[in-house]
């Protein structure tokens, strides 16, 4: 039996009482709220320890947050036949700590995927290739959200994190077609080198709120269809030459860069002069420095070569601690 | 290229068990199911069920859900089914199929179906 | 389950002419996403079955294209447009939509 369930959908929602018999396919699985309608299947805040086996295959966007998932093995979501219609996929606040290889294999339209607000101690490399081979058949995804999934440091693997979510990106040349990433606020102190190269479609990229201090061994360049760029709230202290020619390069970008902590010294001279020249920064204007003490507050646009000046280093013998 | 192998017979006695194997190669066994079918002599195709061996879940047929039991090993990238409580009505061909996403020159991403077959092990249930 | 009833179940017919084999559903197989999981089968003596046709009227690589499938709901057909000798044995529809899956009773196609 199926009850009405409130919801802001305009297409009613069907909850699903658990029965004895095995569901029809087009039946809602226990747990859950579905409307056919909306293409649309609802199991949240439900302490789910596994993804229901028994989903529509009409699905097309599938809830499944506020869970208690832990792991997502391979073959997830593999279905006979497959939930070929599957776009959107959101899995964010589901306690998984482990998203294994091959977990989104046989969702041949999944074009969104959310993982946020999961603690990911381990995140597989071939999570969205779905195989070790070289190169992979091209993975659907457009849109992948991966804010916030660093665990706690007690949880952490040996390798470094940052390494582990890129080694997931760049598996395989799977996410060639991916549009939109977000990784924000996930405490990454660095880019992987290579991860940007292999994903030449990106249009949007959200690094905010991580803490980022240098980007001089990052290669924006042929990320050719970049929109925005979000750096907000990292540790940014100075964009060097190469990054900032690599940035107004790019035909459409727009830049974010509030909130970091920059150092108005000498090394700084170079950022200001193309701060005033340039159209890529949004909200160029409330840049303000950090750093030296002195400079607390004063706003990047305003400085001249005048105000950026470095202290002389003192020879050992003269330096005091 | 895919190739999935099967012994070619088996001969066992009445109430006992069978396990019979169905080896592949050339292809992500992992990414697959294994799909099992029965054949009579001189009769149709019966679904037994299918296993994902990414994740060990199986689907049964009613019919056979207490006669089949799908387990995989994926270090040797080998399906298995095991049979039990044998009677004359399990005398069969028993073949293996591979189910999945077919790779033709028209891209569809909803077109899965069983693409490749072993050739079948014959069982004899016998005294 | 879905009763899956192919006729005729013998198909005498002569090199070169035209081949047509109907398959009927108990029961609707196009699934809630509109995708039909009908799919065609020969099985030549001594063989296992091979894939010919998949969902409903397309046709699996290296299948040549005298083969044709048609059909929608519970109404199906697979013409063979020019028989040829390597097309004889035994035909069978399937649906892949609602578990379990099931066969056609198979129709075996012969020499006249």
């Known amino acids: 039996t199926s009850s009405a369930s409130s919801s802001s959908s305009s297409a009613p929602f069907l909850a699903s009482a658990a029965s004895a018999q095995p569901p029809l396919p087009d039946q809602c699985p226990a747990l859950c709220e579905c409307s056919e309608a909306a293409r649309t299947v609802k199991c949240v805040n439900r302490n789910l320890t596994e993804v229901p086996t028994d989903l529509p295959l009409y699905v097309r966007n599938l809830f499944l947050t506020g869970n208690q998932l832990a792991v997502l093995p391979a073959g997830a979501f593999a279905r006979r036949p497959p939930l070929a219609e599957l776009a959107a996929l959101n899995l964010s606040g589901s306690r998984l700590d482990e998203v294994r290889g091959g977990a989104f294999e046989h969702l041949p339209s999944l074009r969104q995927l959310d993982l946020s607000h999961n603690p990911l101690a381990y995140l597989s490399p071939f999570a969205f290739s779905g195989s070790n081979a070289s190169i992979s058949a091209p993975s659907p995804l457009v849109e992948l959200i991966l804010n916030h999934i660093v665990p706690p440091d007690d949880k952490r693997q040996n390798r470094s994190f940052e390494g582990m979510v890129a080694a997931a990106l760049v598996a395989g040349r799977a996410l060639q077609g991916l549009h939109l990433l977000e990784l924000a606020s996930n405490h990454f102190l660095y880019l992987p080198r290579d991860v940007l190269a292999q994903l030449p479609s990106l249009r949007y990229l959200d690094l905010s709120n991580n803490s980022l201090v240098s980007l001089t061994y990052v290669s924006f360049r042929n990320l050719t269809h970049l929109e925005s760029l979000h750096l907000e709230d990292n540790a940014l202290k100075v964009l060097h030459n190469g990054t900032l020619a690599e940035l107004q390069g790019l035909p459409h970008v727009r830049v974010f860069l509030d909130n970091n902590p920059w150092v108005c010294d000498c090394h700084m001279a170079d950022m200001v002069t193309w701060l005033k020249q340039t159209g890529v920064v949004q909200g160029k204007d409330r840049l303000t420095c950090a750093f030296p003490e002195k400079m607390r507050n004063r706003v990047l646009l305003e400085l001249n070569s005048a105000d950026l000046d470095c202290d002389p280093i003192l020879p050992p013998s003269l330096q005091t601690s | 290229q895919v190739q999935l192998q099967q012994p070619g017979a088996e001969l066992v006695k009445p109430g006992a068990s069978v396990k019979m194997s169905c080896k592949a190669s050339?292809?992500?066994?992992?990414s697959y199911w294994i799909t099992w079918v029965k054949q009579r002599p001189g009769q149709g195709l019966e679904w037994?069920?299918?296993?994902?061996?990414?994740?060990?879940?199986?689907n049964y047929n009613e019919k056979f859900k207490s006669k089949a039991t799908l387990t995989v090993d994926t270090s040797s990238s080998t399906a298995y089914m095991q049979l039990s409580s044998l009677t004359s009505e399990d005398s069969a061909v028993y073949n293996c199929?591979?189910?999945?996403?077919?790779?033709?020159?028209?891209?569809?991403?909803?077109?899965?179906?069983?693409?490749?077959w072993g050739q079948g092990t014959s069982v004899t249930v016998s005294s | 389950d879905v009763l899956m009833t192919q006729t005729p179940l013998s198909l005498p017919v002569s090199l070169g002419d035209q081949a047509s084999i109907s398959c009927r559903s108990s029961?609707?197989?196009?699934?809630?996403?509109?995708?039909?999981?009908l799919e065609w089968y020969l099985q030549k003596p001594g063989q296992s079955p091979k894939l010919l046709i998949y969902k409903v009227s397309n046709r699996f690589s290296g299948v040549p294209d005298r083969f044709s499938g048609s059909g929608s709901g519970t109404d199906f057909t697979l013409k063979i447009s020019r028989v040829e000798a390597e097309d004889l044995g035994v035909y069978y529809c399937?649906?892949?939509?609602?578990?379990?899956?099931?066969f056609g009773s198979g129709t075996k196609l012969e020499i006249k």
């Open positions: 199929a591979r189910y999945g996403p077919l790779f033709t020159t028209v891209v569809d991403p909803n077109s899965y179906a069983m693409d490749y």
């Open positions: 399937f649906q892949g939509s609602h578990v379990p899956f099931t």
């Open positions: 050339g292809y992500t066994f992992t």
């Open positions: 029961q609707s197989i196009v699934y809630s996403n509109g995708n039909t999981y």
């Open positions: 037994i069920g299918d296993i994902y061996p990414g994740s060990g879940r199986a």
